[in-house]
Interface confidence: low
């Protein structure tokens, strides 16, 4: 039987797990699937981590590919750096290992690219179109600690069956992450259920010590207990519940206090009522009802920007509509003349240069930069009317090219369940399906953002869409989410589904990646709330159509918008955006928009940051990284970060000085 038709599998160490999901997904879908389980796409940064991935993936079929957590925005090539301008989905570019299948090319990198790992051979990295569905994906889950696998006992009827917090069920684990459950069946007919929990003395361990399979006591049916049966000294049995559950009135069954809890967002067992409610980052408990969460409203300050205000963690930036440019004060906008038309022409020239159009996602994988023409670049050059974001533009496609709308897999977690402790701070609970279409809307001209009115129509509080302002008084800056939501009361024509044009502002310290909104329809207004943004999540900037399509009442159509809002590095405060941030520049990290589907050209003005990171040489240029043997596979090597014609194509273990080079703000992600 083809192992790729089988269930997901995982390999865990004491502090993290890698899981392989053999499911055909695009990069965005794979990223979201990992996030929904509380993890991220795999980021094998060291030879040791790569070895763990190798052992998990094994010798798969030669043609199979697995997404890992590396992506690069269009025109972000940095060929002299180990990751070639790619960024981990955790938001940084630090690595002590690379495993490129091919040399870097000096092409213009016209499209967004993502990286997949070959399931066969040396598990080399291939880059390609993010919108292509490959054979599977690798997730990585970090945790506070792990319990060792249980030793088999003589009285067991079979091996322990483990269920991880990310819903993998197997008997094959060596380590079980905190929150895992072990089910042991005994020959005497009863069984035991153990939870990997925090121990009072510190660390983690199983909720119950062995031996688990004694021939007397709670047999034959676990003493009638739903969870744990305890044999008391006087011979009678009592029932206990695993952590997070409480004993029901019958003294035998266990109930989840959060199952009936009226928490709007997240619930944690414990507290005087048996549960306590929590709000995701970016939300706070309502003053009149702590079970409800209300959005922390920002950017509503009138006059912050003349036209458009985009919020990001720790600050905001002003932008101007098409045909206007930001004045020196960073707030006002003035007409820009015919710049947009020229920008479109320049873009057309660039895309068509060397015959390297955008990429065709029907093509199979290839490993060099710039491969795969997705959509002919000329499609982007169609003339457009001034954008009115109350109207949903939709390009026409031949019938056989009509974009498919991939829904995220509904299996894990159950769509309406709030994440359980201890994962409430990191699991994305998607309460409505998010629909992503990677097709190309008709674009405004190249260098100008779409027109988004900064002043809102007068609406009732319920219909207003929050725009986040500069600072949360009650949160550290690294956890402040950014949302720009713009209301329009005009309705789109009935036959056109609305779309959300997503853009991703550059983010700072928290290594944040995008999240997906919960959406409620309020009259003719679509109110979008982003779920709270825990670390490793980035905000979306959204412009909203007014009405959801009748065929998908609970779905948002996310449509990527190619127009870029430039983020200017801190070394260029005089350029045309306003950046107000309490965050120290030394800690600013460029983060990719991991959710932005591919094939969208990044339409940036050709500004080069003045603070380009210079290569760093290790202190000991002749020191070697430890050689990790791999079965006829690439061995790690030391590569000095010196200027060279192109980066290494083989697996590379970099000197420690390389790790010190945190990503400066020389990549601008939107």
């Amino acid at each position: 039987q083809d192992p790729w038709a089988a269930e997901p599998r995982a390999a865990c160490g004491p502090s993290s797990c890698y899981a392989l999901f053999p499911r055909r997904r695009t990069f965005l879908e794979a990223w979201r699937a990992c996030r929904e389980l509380g993890g991220d796409l795999a980021t094998p940064r060291t030879p040791e981590e790569a070895q763990r991935v190798d052992s998990l993936v094994g010798a798969g079929p030669a043609s199979r590919l697995l997404w890992i957590g590396l992506q690069r925005q269009a025109r972000q090539c940095q060929l002299q750096r180990p990751l070639r301008g790619f960024t981990w989905t955790t938001g940084d570019q630090d690595t002590a290992f690379t495993n490129w299948a091919q040399p870097a090319s000096g092409g213009p990198c016209p499209a967004q690219r993502c990286v997949a790992l070959e399931a066969s051979g040396e598990h080399r990295w291939l880059e390609g179109s993010c919108t292509l569905a490959v054979d599977g994906y690798l997730c990585q889950f970090g945790f506070e600690g792990a319990c060792p696998a249980l030793q088999d006992e003589a009285g067991q009827a079979g091996p322990a069956v483990y269920t991880t917090p990310f819903h993998l069920v197997s008997t094959e684990f060596e380590w079980l992450p905190f929150g895992s459950v072990a089910a042991v069946q005994c020959q005497a007919g009863r069984g035991a259920s153990l939870l990997c929990v925090k121990q009072p003395e510190g660390g983690v361990g199983w909720s119950r010590a062995g031996p688990l399979c004694l021939g007397t006591g709670c047999s034959p049916d676990n003493g009638g207990c739903e969870h744990e049966c305890v044999e008391e000294v006087d011979g009678h049995v009592s029932c206990r519940c695993t952590e997070g559950f409480r004993l029901a009135a019958d003294g035998r069954s266990c109930e989840d206090p959060c199952a009936q809890a009226p928490c709007e967002q997240q619930c944690e067992p414990g507290g005087p009522q048996g549960y306590s409610c929590h709000c995701r980052l970016g939300f706070r408990p309502a003053e009149d009802d702590p079970h409800r969460c209300v959005d922390t409203d920002e950017c509503q300050i009138a006059g912050v920007c003349q036209q458009m205000c985009v919020n990001y963690v720790g600050g905001f930036e002003c932008y101007c509509s098409e045909g206007h440019e930001l004045e020196a004060d960073g707030i006002s906008c003035s007409p820009a003349g015919a710049m947009g038309a020229q920008a479109s022409q320049d873009l057309g020239d660039e895309l068509l240069d060397d015959g390297e159009d955008e990429e065709d996602e029907d093509e199979a994988w290839k490993a060099f930069n710039g491969g795969w023409t997705e959509m002919p670049g000329i499609l982007w050059m169609e003339p457009t009317q001034p954008p009115d974001f109350a109207l949903a533009y939709r390009p026409s496609f031949p019938e056989d090219r009509e974009p498919q709308i991939p829904y995220p897999e509904p299996t894990w977690p159950p769509p309406l369940s709030a994440p359980r402790v201890p994962y409430h701070s990191s699991v994305l609970s998607v309460t409505r399906p998010v629909v992503v279409s990677a097709t190309h809307p008709t674009l405004p001209s190249a260098h100008q953002p779409p027109v988004i009115p900064a002043t809102h129509p007068a609406l009732s509080r319920d219909h207003q869409i929050p725009v986040i302002a500069a600072n949360y008084p009650d949160l550290p800056s690294a956890y402040q989410p950014g949302i720009l939501s713009v209301s329009h009361s005009a309705q789109p024509p009935a036959h056109q589904p609305p779309m959300i044009s997503t853009k991703y502002p550059e983010l700072f310290p928290a290594h944040q990646s995008p999240m997906f909104p919960d959406t409620r329809v309020a009259g003719t207004q679509t109110t979008t709330h982003l779920p709270g943004i825990p670390p490793n999540h980035a905000p979306l900037v959204t412009t909203l159509g007014a009405q959801l399509p009748p065929q998908a009442p609970d779905a948002l159509v996310l449509r990527t918008q190619a127009t870029q809002l430039p983020i200017i590095p801190t070394a260029q405060p005089s350029l045309t955006t306003t950046s107000r941030s309490p965050v120290s520049p030394a800690h600013q990290i460029s983060v990719p928009a991991a959710t932005q589907p591919a094939a969208l050209p990044t339409l940036l003005p050709s500004q080069s940051p003045t603070n380009q990171t210079s290569p760093i040489s290790p202190t000991h240029p002749h020191s070697k990284a430890p050689q990790i043997p791999r079965e006829d596979g690439p061995s790690p090597k030391l590569a000095l970060w010196l200027p060279s014609p192109a980066p290494t194509a083989a697996p590379t273990a970099l000197g420690e000085a390389g790790l010190a080079e945190h990503s400066q703000r020389d990549d601008r992600w939107l």
Partner: antibody, heavy 116, light 107 residues
Framework: EVQLVESGGGLVQPGRSMKLSCAAS????????MAWVRQAPTRGLEWVAS????????YYRDSVKGRFTISRDTAENTLYLQMDSLRSEDTATYYC?????????WGQGVRVTVSS | DIVLTQSPTTLSVTPGETVSLSCRAS??????LHWYQQKTNESPRLLIK???QSMSGIPSRFSASGSGTDFTLNIKNVEFDDVSSYFC?????????FGSGTKLEIK
Amino acid sequence: EVQLVESGGGLVQPGRSMKLSCAASGFTFRNYYMAWVRQAPTRGLEWVASTGSGGDFTYYRDSVKGRFTISRDTAENTLYLQMDSLRSEDTATYYCARAYGYFDYWGQGVRVTVSS
Amino acid sequence: DIVLTQSPTTLSVTPGETVSLSCRASHSVGTNLHWYQQKTNESPRLLIKDASQSMSGIPSRFSASGSGTDFTLNIKNVEFDDVSSYFCQQTQSWPLTFGSGTKLEIK
């Protein structure tokens, strides 16, 4: 077993065209970069061209750019090299190779002689 | 283009000797350097990939080292069967280039 078998060589006059083929078997052709490498007695081994696994992305050495075209038929597991405007300095044995960065498998080679 | 210079051009040894072949790159190629063996009237065969990793099926007498610009192929206990030309090749950047080769002869 990985096998690469070239065909289509022979004698051709300068300025004329010739098309080489390479039949691949024993591996998943569509997943690999492929390349042509040539060897002339006077010039040693010389990389000629590479193609991405989908066939749409190609690389050439400067001296053949605009004259040679590398292509592939994934359905037929075949790699091609269309050589136009041939010159005497193109005379060589042409090898088809699987290009995994390095060239891990080579064909037996096919002789191309450009002479009037 | 990255130029690879191999030395010596020809090497004549007696069986059982250990020999070292050199390959020098005009620019750093990291460890993206590979060694091939080519016997008379045969196709090249990959011996060593990524500067030091032996391919499966290659006798352990063959080893290699180096990174950056200087690389060495070592052959211990040379046998008659080792009579060949040895080429280095870089895959650090386009165009891919080969060295001019070292011809190993047995005295």
